[in-house]
Interface confidence: medium
């Protein structure tokens, strides 16, 4: 008997969608593993007597639920099935958007880049496909543990009035207010203001 | 952590009104906005109401022009005016902040 793969998972990010799982112990030799997916009610290949331990699904409609299932295969031997379920729009992660942080005298310049799509057109990107789309900015004077949040109106925003010759740490990540669905914060940006550009009278 | 905690729920008939109350605790210094959402039985979860850290709000399309979201000056707590009632607001209405849930208020409209 053949044991099915364990720990079945898919690892979802902006779309690129990874079927993972791990290889069982098998004592009579190397397992090889056939992939598949639901298609108008018939399952499809989708990686077949592969040695990989993953699969890539990221062509599957966005919308809508997918069955997915893998098996263990040897020889003429083969697992039990193991499905798992999965809704792109609902289930992938929102990865972290790109920054560009320019500082201008005491304020903070911030452009935000939302996620590319994986298999889709060079210009495709999260805002397309979620339509209340939005960003959180997560800042904080550098050293200091209280952070402030604002939610941009758009890809860019101005943090003004800050303290002058001071070092401020930056973060953005996507937000679906109509989901509550947070993305990953992207990695901290930390710059440091130059002189108040205000001329005393 | 942030705990997200709702309040006002109950029965009430056709036509009537509810204000629901979500009071967030813990560390709270970054929860500048939180919005309302519910999900029937049978149905998934749907935004109700969103209230962004500049006081801009969004609403969804069924609620529109009967529910009004607002909240306090210390941005703590969030609440939910539910005016003008139909059967199919009966939910479980939830308080969400950037992917934070509250445990759901139960609203049951009655004919």
């Known amino acids: 008997m053949v044991p099915p793969p364990e720990n079945v998972r898919m690892n979802s990010v902006n779309f690129k969608n990874i079927l993972q799982w791990e290889s069982p112990a098998f004592a009579k030799g190397n397992l090889t593993f056939t992939a598949q997916y639901l298609s108008y009610r018939i399952f499809q290949d989708k990686c077949m007597n592969t040695t990989l331990t993953e699969c890539d699904f990221s062509s599957l409609s966005k919308y809508g639920d997918h069955t997915l299932r893998v098996r263990a295969e040897f020889a003429d031997e083969h697992s039990d099935w193991v499905n798992i379920t999965f809704c792109p729009v609902d289930d992938t992660i929102i990865g972290p958007p790109g920054m560009q942080v320019e500082v201008l005298a005491d304020s903070l310049h911030m452009r935000f880049l939302a996620p590319k799509i994986e298999n889709e057109y060079e210009t495709w990107t999260m805002k397309n496909v979620y339509n209340s789309w939005t960003y959180n900015v997560q800042y904080w004077k550098n050293g200091t543990d209280e952070k402030f949040q604002i939610t941009p109106q758009y890809d860019f925003e101005v943090l003004r009035n800050l303290e002058p010759w001071t070092t401020y740490c930056v973060q953005v990540r996507g937000f679906l207010p109509d989901r509550n669905k947070a993305g990953e914060w992207s990695e901290p940006v930390c710059e440091q203001t130059t002189h108040d550009e205000t001329v005393p009278s | 952590q942030v705990q997200l905690v709702e309040s006002g729920g109950g029965v009430v008939q056709a036509g009537g009104s509810l204000r629901l109350s979500c009071a967030a605790s813990g560390s709270t210094s970054t929860l500048d906005h939180m919005g309302w959402y519910r999900q029937a039985p049978g149905k998934s979860r749907e935004l109700v109401g969103y209230m962004f850290t500049d006081g801009r709000t969004q609403y969804g399309e069924p609620v529109k022009g009967r529910f009004t979201v607002s909240r306090d000056n210390g941005r703590n707590t969030i609440f939910l005016q539910m005016n003008n009632l139909k059967l199919e607001d009966t939910a479980v209405y939830y308080c969400?902040?950037?992917?934070?849930w509250g445990q759901g208020t139960q609203v049951t409209v009655s004919s």
């Open positions: 969400g902040a950037q992917g934070i």
